[in-house]
Interface confidence: low
Amino acid sequence: FERTRSLQDPCSNCPAGTFCDNNRNQICSPCPPNSFSSAGGQRTCDICRQCKGVFRTRKECSSTSNAECDCTPGFHCLGAGCSMCEQDCKQGQELTKKGCKDCCFGTFNDQKRGICRPWTNCSLDGKSVLVNGTKERDVVCGPSPADLSPGASSVTPPAPAREPGHSPQ
């Protein structure tokens, strides 16, 4: 069967890293520099992805596999295969149309990417606030007020008003 298939389609014999060159009587030619074929039987080689600008090379291109990119320090990947790089922000910030902005009061972000998320509402679980939240950290919920031993006290969270200078995102 293999013999029959190769008689019907000589290109099926061309391995990954080569292409079936119609200009040379379907000889298997090596992929030229900066191109690759990841499977056999290919009639062309694909151009290697180039990691330029804010992208940097995580894995070099080879004759059989494409280059893989990640982002330079200060940026992180977005999209399948790191198709985009997005600016990092500090913890306690989120990226907006106008750049990095501090999280509004009552929200936090403990990463350099993503959006600010609301503090956990401890009272929904019948618990009290043990440690106040910050821009960088969520609140820590403690035992329910009824479970507190004499002398222990929970932190009363401040009213969820916005801090001066922090507009809604």
């Epitope: 600008g53 198709s83 907006t96 149309k97």
Partner: antibody, heavy 116, light 112 residues
Framework: SVEESGGRLVTPGTPLTLTCTVS????????VTWVRQPPGKGLEWIGV?????ATAFATWAKGRFTMSKNSTTVALKVTSPTTEDTATYFC??????????????WGQGTLVTVSS | DIVMTQTPSSVSAAVGGTVTINCQAS??????LSWYQQKLGQPPKLLIY???TLESGVPSRFKGSGSGTEYTLTISDLESDDAATYYC??????????????FGGGTGVVVK
């Protein structure tokens, strides 16, 4: 190479799809950018579609256009054309880089005329 | 969104002369700037990217420079074939999940 097609005379509000057909390179590793040029005016960037199908549009173009692709073509749909959308529409191969895209292979353009 | 202000809107110079085109961004664009040439009835042609990198096959008479918000395209030893409209194009960050690019208004170059 890249080649645009689908440009024609349409009445306002009639959806129109333009097609960019590529050859000699793979859309798996390149982005495709759409730019338009109203008669006698400058270039206007519309949007880009990346290797993984992710899209980005100019602020003015959001909601007015959609983009999709398969292995050899990229489609730009003008959802509800107005007379202001009369222009030559170009597609171009771009570096697959969200922060420094430049377009180094352009089609000849396809003319869209929107008129009642 | 970023605004790219290109000056002058048109310029005239003699063969062999030098032309300078400026492009000012409304904010720092970190050299993410390209220059294109467009002749009548033709698509744009990439000349320079990343502010100063010459595209393959483009004559060294074309020079890009600048940083921050101010960028310049200089065409020296002007030839009649350089008569065209020139556009700058820059990156901008449009939103958390999207990016975009914007063109300057264009500069027409007339060669006498």
């Amino acid at each position: 190479s890249v080649e645009e097609s689908g440009g024609r005379l349409v009445t306002p509000g009639t959806p129109l799809t333009l097609t960019c057909t590529v050859s000699g390179f793979s859309l798996t590793y390149y982005a495709v950018t759409w730019v338009r040029q109203p008669p006698g005016k400058g270039l206007e960037w519309i949007g880009v579609i990346y290797d993984n199908g992710a899209t980005a549009f100019a602020t003015w173009a959001k909601g007015r256009f959609t983009m999709s692709k398969n292995s050899t073509t990229v489609a730009l749909k003008v959802t509800s054309p107005t007379t202001e959308d009369t222009a030559t529409y170009f597609c171009a191969r771009s570096a697959n880089n969200a922060w420094s895209t430049y377009s180094n292979l352009w089609g000849q353009g396809t003319l869209v005329t929107v008129s009642s | 969104d970023i605004v790219m202000t290109q000056t002058p809107s048109s310029v005239s110079a003699a063969v062999g002369g030098t032309v300078t085109i400026n492009c000012q961004a409304s904010e720092d664009i970190s050299s993410y700037l390209s220059w294109y040439q467009q002749k009548l009835g033709q698509p744009p042609k990439l000349l320079i990217y990343k502010a100063s990198t010459l595209e393959s096959g483009v004559p060294s008479r074309f020079k890009g420079s600048g940083s921050g918000t101010e960028y310049t395209l200089t065409i020296s030893d002007l030839e009649s074939d350089d008569a065209a409209t020139y556009y700058c194009q820059s990156y901008y960050s449009g939103s958390i999940s999207g990016y975009g690019f914007v063109f300057g208004g264009g500069t027409g170059v007339v060669v006498k």
